[in-house]
């Protein structure tokens, strides 16, 4: 009898109520492998989820997140709110990055500006909420008498260096 069931292809199930005949999966269900005793219920993409791929008799639906949200977890098991660049998502919703930190994405946390002096360099472009600082030549390279092809560029953005 087990051999009869193993002959049931994906998209069907082995129906014990009908002498182990291979029956098609009912609507809104699927079986992705052969020899299944039951079909699995299709995933529903509702609310913050939207359908990326419709359910078929042989494969589950695949969900994505609606605009303004992004997927988390395996197979987009969760959706999380986007924030603007220069913000991070907290328990109180999207909040601006604190001074000295930045986030250049719509997700994730605010990270500290690079400390240029740790690498012996100077700040070429100041940091903002949305952008990290840009480190330039070391102060020694800019001292009188040092050979430097180009003078240091002035800071082009508002904000301050973390030093």
């Amino acid at each position: 009898l087990q051999d009869l069931c193993s002959n049931c292809p994906a998209g069907t199930f082995c129906d014990n109520n009908r002498s182990q005949i291979c029956s098609p999966c009912p609507p809104n269900s699927f079986s992705s492998a052969g020899g299944q005793r039951t079909c699995d219920i299709c995933r529903q993409c509702k609310g913050v989820f939207k359908t990326r791929k419709e359910c078929s008799s042989t494969s589950n639906a695949e969900c994505d997140c609606i605009s303004g949200y992004h997927c988390l977890g395996a197979e987009c098991s969760m959706c999380e709110q986007d924030c603007k660049q220069g913000q991070e998502l907290t328990k109180k919703g999207c909040k601006d990055c604190c001074f000295g930190t930045f986030n250049d994405q719509k997700r994730g946390i605010c990270r500290p500006w690079t400390n240029c002096s740790l690498d012996g360099k100077s700040v070429l472009v100041n940091g903002t909420k949305e952008r990290d600082v840009v480190c330039g030549p070391s102060p020694a390279d800019l001292s009188p008498g040092a050979s430097s092809a180009t003078p240091p560029a002035p800071a082009r953005e508002p904000g301050h260096s973390p030093q």
Epitope: G47, V48, L72, S77, M78, C79, E80, L89
Partner: nanobody, 123 residues
């Protein structure tokens, strides 16, 4: 089957109050943060409030702070949104959602949604 069912929406005048309810089933309710979202006509989905598993922490979107109160009754597998001093801009479909495993510790992702209940604030 994991399910969330909202109720309590309706038509209310500006300045009035409504209490929304969300009944949960099919999962261990007391192990999840619960969240309220809303979607105003023609607008995107907006987070409104959420509440920790045991009700000890509650957080609100700035525009509803002081007017809305989220609460839960784990014995009844329900979460509530008490809405006072309602304004025309509160008109929306309100949804409750379940916070996924690890919610607030490592992410703010939600994984289960209700069908929504409509709140209309109009004179």
């Amino acid at each position: 089957e994991v399910q969330l069912v909202e109720s309590g929406g309706g038509l209310v005048q500006p300045g009035g109050s409504l209490r929304l309810s969300c009944a949960a089933s099919g999962f261990t309710f007391s192990s999840h943060w619960m969240t309220w979202f809303r979607q105003a006509p023609g607008k995107g989905l907006e987070w409104v409030a959420h509440i920790k598993e045991d009700g000890s922490e509650k957080y609100y979107e700035d525009s509803v702070e002081g007017r809305f109160t989220v609460s839960r009754d784990n014995a009844k597998n329900s979460v509530y949104l008490q809405m006072n001093s309602l304004r025309a801009e509160d008109t929306a479909v309100y949804y409750c959602a379940r916070g996924g495993d690890g919610y607030s510790d490592s992410h703010f992702g939600v994984d289960v949604w209700g069908q929504g209940t409509t709140v209309t604030v109009s004179s």
